[in-house]
């Protein structure tokens, strides 16, 4: 993974488009699209004033934690779908794409150095806990995925890529 590949806005746009497509196919889908349990996902709301005042390292922690939790949530969704009696094929395809996309984003963020930035404070337990919400449908899960990409992830990469250019 070239270190600055994620700094090309088209790369993030590709994953965002996939997430939006996934969200769209679940619109109005009730029968096949329930998760049948509440899955914890990151709260994608961003306080822009607080975000701008954050050190890039703290932003990296938030993004890395969010990405890890979102990945875990989509993996859980994938497992629930596999274990369901009749998985809806279009949904299965988009869930698989989301897992793959999140893995690629993990690799791209790693290459950018997000993992190095996201070192723990001296007392790891003092790290601010990630704010979370729950998703009970695939639609909500995909909406969180697309909101995370266009929110914290886009903000972080914008800042990290700009910092790296200096």
């Amino acid at each position: 993974a070239p270190p600055r590949l994620i700094c090309d806005s088209r790369v993030l746009e590709r994953y965002l488009l996939e997430a939006k497509e996934a969200e769209n196919i679940t619109t109005g889908c009730a029968e096949h699209c329930s998760l049948n349990e509440n899955i914890t996902v990151p709260d994608t709301k961003v306080n822009f004033y607080a975000w701008k005042r954050m050190e890039v390292g703290q932003q990296a922690v938030e993004v890395w934690q969010g990405l890890a939790l979102l990945s875990e949530a989509v993996l859980r969704g994938q497992a629930l779908l596999v274990n369901s009696s009749q998985p809806w094929e279009p949904l299965q395809l988009h869930v698989d794409k989301a897992v793959s996309g999140l893995r690629s984003l993990t690799t791209l963020l790693r290459a950018l150095g997000a993992q190095k930035e996201a070192i723990s404070p001296p007392d790891a337990a003092s790290a601010a806990p990630l704010r979370t919400i729950t998703a009970d449908t695939f639609r909500k899960l995909f909406r969180v995925y697309s909101n995370f990409l266009r929110g914290k992830l886009k903000l972080y990469t914008g800042e990290a890529c700009r910092t790296g250019d200096r």
Partner: antibody
Framework: QVQLVQSGAEVKKPGASVKVSCKAS????????INWVRQAPGQGLEWMGW????????NYAQKLQGRVTMTTDTSTSTAYMELRSLRSDDTAVYYC????????????WGQGTLVTVSS | DIQMTQSPSSLSASVGDRVTITCQAS??????LNWYQQKPGKAPKLLIY???NLETGVPSRFSGSGSGTDFTFTISSLQPEDVATYYC?????????FGGGTKVEIK
């Protein structure tokens, strides 16, 4: 720097239980998963299971289901692996390893804990 | 479960030789494959992730390629310190599985 430090060697009798600890430092513990991998003497690597340090969610290898439990204590950044009803073929070096999100590559490993099961 | 078949199980080569190890998955695993090096009495060490990405700090003589079911790990110029056992590992699906390992020795 990132470190995973495991508890010391154990000798157990068949039928007993063992609990191995793995203390993490140098990173935000809840951002990564902890995997457990074992290696019998002279053999290859066998994945035992994964534990989310954030949510506590787990996924265990089918052959160990019902005998293994993986837990964490986030206040001390420590992961635990308990294996019950030990048999002689459980004799192995047990490793904890850090994994990233849905990308299960293990970039840091503990030093290993030798568990010997013998009557 | 996805089976990972690694070959050869052992090999002996001279310092400076090009060494190639292959790993075959029993089903398509995309690029969700990693390579580890394990020296006697030590924990494994990540060398390559996502089939072809070199882990930070790993010498560039190590490389990986492949996608789908067939993967290759290469040491372009074998060094004495490369004596170890090398494992591939898939993470396309649970349970995660490792290849049987390839023991590399110096002639």
């Amino acid at each position: 720097q990132v470190q995973l430090v495991q508890s010391g060697a154990e000798v157990k009798k068949p039928g007993a239980s063992v609990k191995v600890s793995c203390k993490a430092s140098g990173y935000t513990f809840t951002t990564y998963g902890i995997n457990w991998v074992r290696q019998a003497p002279g053999q290859g690597l066998e994945w035992m299971g994964w534990l989310s340090a954030y949510s506590g969610n787990t996924n265990y290898a089918q052959k160990l289901q019902g005998r293994v439990t993986m837990t964490t204590d986030t206040s001390t950044s420590t992961a635990y692996m308990e294996l019950r009803s030990l048999r002689s073929d459980d004799t192995a070096v047990y490793y904890c390893a850090r994994g990233v999100g849905a990308s299960f590559y293990f970039d840091y490993w503990g030093q290993g804990t030798l568990v010997t099961v013998s009557s | 479960d996805i089976q990972m078949t690694q070959s050869p199980s052992s090999l002996s080569a001279s310092v400076g030789d090009r060494v190639t190890i292959t790993c075959q998955a029993s089903q398509d695993i995309s690029n969700f494959l990693n390579w580890y090096q394990q020296k006697p009495g030590k924990a494994p060490k990540l060398l390559i992730y996502d089939a072809s990405n070199l882990e930070t700090g790993v010498p560039s003589r190590f490389s990986g390629s492949g996608s789908g079911t067939d993967f290759t790990f290469t040491i372009s110029s074998l060094q004495p310190e490369d004596v170890a056992t090398y494992y591939c590992q898939q993470y396309d699906n649970f349970p995660l599985t490792f290849g049987g390992g390839t023991k590399v020795e110096i002639k």
